[in-house]
């Protein structure tokens, strides 16, 4: 199919164009010497004017946008359904683990409770806040959950003759449940257990969250003018020719796309290093490392902790009748 | 020990978390996940051929466009940019990422130095300090059953199988995810552009 | 940005319930991590917490007036509302209702104008 | 009675250093926030947890909280810094606030 000679008329051009862009004022009726174009050089006579050069350009960066957002469709819809469900999935986890340890309480220790189903809440809703991202310390957490519970244990299980609890005694009920290790080594246990395996859990999600980012980044790429004047002349300059059947050759193609996406392949290697490093993190996370293992198997270690204090009883309680004696005549003027 | 209430424990030991048949654990479906992620290693790499395979190139036809002329498919002149005295190719590569490339690189840079951190090294799954504090029980079974807490009486097997099929309101198949599968080649070290993103499976 | 608005009545008789609607826009208590609080502030006195309640509808209340508080939100409307049973003339104050960050320790960094 | 104490009231001269305490049984464990209110108007936030400053809050205001004491300060006060500030700490699950300074 050779170019159109001089006398011959732009018509199958206009009605190609006119798909493009309604409105044929740009279209010349034959074909011109196109000295102002600066993509679609000619070589003789052309059908295209600079106003249709600019909207090819136009559209040509366009089109590239959709063939990018198609290409990674699917892989954007894998990470933002897995993101959404294991979210979704460890608050699942966070809840059922609450409801067992309340339960725990319910069933072993009824005078704890409600008091105790409160701090369970408190320490749950921070494990929850934690996994999405929140500047909470797992230590301090637990710290505050055995902080918590143990003026209860004291003035409800060990010396039920104290009035109701006020924040006074209740502080220096906190500062002797640290200082003499009243649980014993269950809280550093806890502490151990809950910090490594939500760190994982939340570094997993915070990279399915990167990997979403990573997707939309490159999906909504605005390509350069440079690439948008390769692209045209790929795409529509044989127009200009007449030659509106002909396609782009393979090679050519793959020559203009590695420069279009010069920058976007850079990505390639970190990308590469995600999946693996992801896949190793998701290959350590059980036993210690797996939330679900530890946050449904804590209402048990808690429990044990609470027996470790019972059984020591007789001794705490005399050890801390003399270290909170001035909070506890306080409380009883 | 412990008194547990029926409705959450069979044998008073063993914990019963859900009442589904279909038995998914979020550790299986991680793996799953991981599986599938996979096939999307190439995806960058690959990027330029998936879009010349999706976008009208010449297969079958004799002749083809190369930017500047109509020419023969299996001829030199049809991988050559038919018009690079206008502006430089090479150059175009030169200029780097755009901004949002370069900072989006940094942040999986970052993410990938903290997942390698905070991957747990084979075979050492619990702290020495744990093990030397005696905190961790001995035989707890296969990788489904693990033992949470000390020793002894209050000592709970947790059966790991929490199935969120059931309770989770999406319809967890991607397979039938919009758009086409995407596949393209596996070794790491040999980058093939053919008519893909992704992986081969 | 986000505002909250109080609204109740301005006069309540002894022994009476008082209802307190706290309507808020620029966030949604479907949020993880949010909150919203009820503080109280008896003429010329310092502030007192009365209640709180989390995106995941945790309620807290203060221990010395937990038998008659209830506080409850309605999500699709962008409400919270305290109730306080047996109304006496030492609960005379300006009640706020705040935006609290769970996750930031339940700081309450955005107040209502207050209703007296 | 608060568990977090207070000094009814504090004064400065203009330009120079305003330190208010609020003290309580190991406070230096919790995180302290701090609020501002002016006569006839909400309190404001002027510092979270210990040492945080909310934005549209001026570097003039900082905080510090350890052992029994947290401590909010104004550096270079000024006539529109007069008000009531009250500390507050999250007790387990009990919001505390001190009684105020003027």
């Known amino acids: 199919q050779p170019p159109p000679p001089p006398d011959a008329t732009c018509h199958q051009v206009r009605s190609f164009f006119q798909r493009l862009q309604p409105g044929l004022k740009w279209v010349p009726e034959t074909p011109v010497p196109g000295s102002d174009l600066q993509v679609c050089l000619p070589k003789g006579p052309t059908c295209c004017s600079r106003k249709m050069e600019e909207k090819y350009q136009l559209t040509a960066r366009l089109n590239m946008e959709q063939l990018l957002q198609s290409a990674s469709m699917e892989l954007k819809f894998l990470i933002i359904q897995n993101a959404a469900v294991f979210q979704e999935a460890f608050e699942i986890v966070v809840r059922h683990a609450k409801n067992y340890t309340n339960a725990m309480f319910k069933n072993n220790y009824p005078s704890l409770t409600p008091q105790a189903f409160e701090f369970v809440g408190e320490f749950f809703t921070d494990v929850s806040l934690y996994i999405l991202g929140s500047d909470i310390n797992v230590d301090d957490m637990v710290n505050e959950l055995f902080d918590s519970l143990f003026p209860v244990i004291y003035t409800q299980m060990m010396n039920p003759g104290l009035p109701e609890s006020v924040l006074d005694i209740n502080e220096c009920l906190r500062g002797a449940r640290r200082d003499l290790k009243v649980f014993g080594s269950f809280p550093k246990l806890i502490m151990t257990q809950v910090s490594k395996s939500l760190q994982v859990t939340r570094i997993f999600l915070q990279a399915l969250n990167l990997g979403i980012e990573v997707i939309n980044t490159t999906d909504h790429l605005k390509f350069s003018k440079d690439c948008g004047r390769m692209l045209t002349r790929m795409w529509y300059c044989s127009y200009c020719q007449g030659l509106m059947m002909v396609k782009p050759c393979g090679g050519y193609c793959n020559v203009v796309m590695q420069g279009c996406m010069a920058g976007v392949v850079e990505i390639d290697k970190y990308w590469r290093e995600y999946i693996l490093s992801l896949e190793e993190l998701v290959n350590g996370m059980y036993r210690i490392y797996d939330m679900e293992n530890v946050l449904l198997g804590l209402f048990s270690t808690i429990h044990d902790s609470i027996q470790y204090v019972q059984k020591n009883g007789g001794k705490l309680t005399t050890t801390i009748g003399k270290l909170c004696a001035h909070s506890q005549q306080r409380q009883y003027r | 020990s412990a008194y547990y209430p029926e409705d959450l424990f069979i044998d008073k030991k063993i914990l019963k978390v859900a009442h589904v048949e279909h038995e998914e654990t979020l550790s299986s479906r991680r793996r799953e996940l991981i599986q599938k992620l996979k096939s999307f290693i190439n995806f960058y790499s690959a990027l330029p051929g998936y879009i010349c395979s999706h976008s009208p190139v010449a297969e079958n036809d004799t002749l083809c466009w190369n930017g500047q002329e109509l020419v023969e498919r299996y001829s030199q002149k049809a991988a050559r940019n038919g018009m690079k005295n206008q502006f430089n190719l090479h150059e175009l590569k030169m200029k780097g990422p755009e901004p949002v490339v370069s900072q989006i690189i940094d942040k999986l840079k970052h993410i990938n130095q903290l997942l390698r951190t905070m991957s747990v090294p084979k075979g050492k799954v619990l702290d020495k300090s744990l093990d030397e504090e005696g905190l961790e029980s001995g035989d707890c079974g296969d990788d489904e059953d693990e033992c949470i807490g000390s020793s002894g009486d209050g000592m709970v097997k947790v059966k790991n199988q929490l199935r969120f099929l059931a309770e989770l309101a999406y319809d967890l198949d991607v397979d039938d995810a919009p758009g086409n599968k995407q596949h393209g080649n596996q070794k790491d070290n040999e980058i093939t552009t053919s008519h893909s993103v992704g992986n081969m499976p | 940005q986000v505002t909250l608005k109080e609204s109740g009545p301005t006069l309540v008789k002894p022994t009476q319930t008082l209802t307190l609607t706290c309507t808020f826009s620029?966030?949604?208590?479907?949020?993880?991590?949010?909150?919203v609080g009820w503080i109280r502030q008896p003429p010329g006195k310092a502030l007192e917490w009365l209640a709180l309640?989390?995106?995941?509808?945790?309620?807290r209340y203060s221990p010395s007036l937990k038998s008659r508080l209830t506080i409850t939100k309605d999500t699709s409307k962008n409400q919270v509302v305290l109730t306080m049973t047996n109304m006496d003339p030492v609960d005379t104050a300006t009640y706020y209702c705040?935006?609290?960050?769970?996750?930031?320790?339940?700081?309450?960094?955005?107040w209502g104008q207050g209703t007296l | 009675q608060s568990v977090l104490t207070q000094p009814p009231s504090a004064s400065v001269a203009p330009g120079k250093t305003a330190r208010i305490t609020c003290g309580g049984n190991?406070?230096?464990?919790?995180?302290v926030h701090w609020y501002q209110q002016k006569p006839g108007q909400s309190p404001v936030l002027v510092i979270y947890?210990?040492?945080k400053r909310p934005s549209g809050i001026p570097e003039r205001f900082s905080g510090s909280n350890s052992g029994n004491t947290a401590t909010l300060t104004i550096s270079g006060a000024q006539p529109m810094d007069e008000a009531d500030y009250y500390c507050?700490?999250?007790?387990?699950?009990?919001?505390?606030f001190g009684g105020g300074t003027k």
């Open positions: 620029g966030f949604s208590l479907s949020t993880s991590g949010v909150g």
């Open positions: 705040a935006h609290s960050r769970i996750a930031a320790r339940r700081v309450l960094d955005y």
């Open positions: 190991n406070i230096g464990s919790k995180s």
């Open positions: 309640i989390y995106w995941n509808d945790d309620k």
């Open positions: 947890q210990d040492t």
């Open positions: 507050q700490a999250w007790y387990s699950t009990i919001m505390v």
